[in-house]
């Protein structure tokens, strides 16, 4: 929870919290959700997930953690399905409101059948 001094009351903020390790290992053909919770005030205006400079238009959902009017906490999930070896790399979540922008990156490693990562 960010501390707010009297002179900063009107200044907005966004804090992002990863809900899965930011380094993710999956085997090829497997599925994984990349998940963040984030606090945003004022309310978030734009959210996007990006991979290789391309924005996902689907495969993700974004929802408030509570339906209370005073809620400032949100969840965003990117659903990656049947991952191929060529789909490893950096996946980035970006969110902005009228005051600030914030981002978090996930490094996804897809292990091919010939080289499995051991947990």
């Amino acid at each position: 929870q960010p501390s707010v001094s009297p002179g900063e009351v009107d200044k907005g903020f966004i804090n992002i919290f990863p809900m899965i390790n930011t380094t993710v290992f999956v085997n090829d053909g497997e599925n994984v959700d990349l998940i963040v919770e984030y606090e945003a005030f004022p309310k978030p205006e734009h959210q996007q997930w990006i991979y290789m400079n391309r924005t996902f238009t689907d495969k993700w959902e974004d929802y408030p953690k509570s339906e209370n009017e005073s809620n400032i906490r949100y969840v965003s999930e990117l659903h990656l399905t049947r991952l191929k070896g060529t789909e490893g790399g950096t996946y980035t979540f970006l969110v902005s409101n009228s005051d600030v922008n914030a981002a978090i990156a996930f490094n996804v490693y897809v292990n091919t059948k010939h080289h499995h990562h051991h947990h």
Partner: antibody, heavy 120, light 106 residues
Amino acid sequence: EVQLLESGGGLVQPGGSLRLSCAASGFTFSNYKMGWVRQAPGKGLEWVSWIYPSGGGTFQADSVKGRFTISRDNSKNTLYLQMNSLRAEDTAVYYCARVRVGSTGNFDYWGQGTLVTVSS
Amino acid sequence: DIQMTQSPATLSLSPGERATLYCRASQSVSNYVAWYQQRPGQAPRLLMYDTSKRATGIPARFSGSGSGTDFTLTISSLEPEDFAVYYCQQRSYWFAFGGGTKVEIK
């Protein structure tokens, strides 16, 4: 093959505590949300709680909020449910379940359940 | 909170017949409805998710339809192993289950 094996159920007095465990195998546990669902004898299913892959966030049903705590140890591939201040109405079979990727809240694999009986 | 109401409570049918199970949400849940099967003494099994998508390994005789508040699970031709209790569930806001429909042998 995905396997979920619950343990820790039993008879406990009202007001007592119990900790359930669920040992997971056959999948990358640390990549999945996990949850608990319960079923009172002869009744329907009731969602109890679920937890993010990292363990950094949880959701609880109102009926157990403040009394039950879900947690996980990814190094041991194990899910837990700490149940405090137990009531007679908590008597049920408790199922550990994996949350399906891409549809949060749907459970695609279930354990066989462990029975918790709250009675004096 | 969103309530899920299933009907009928019991459905008595013979093998080979078509079964139609209904689920109604107290408010719109988009297409975020799943169906589970629970055989006696067993854990539930996910059949359908997001209204009409079959879960892994579920045979084609199971199908789902609906949107908003009214949903249907259809079993086109009942097999002996299909006699069980079926639950619907919404994931639009939290995760409420319906009370179940028992499909029994007539």
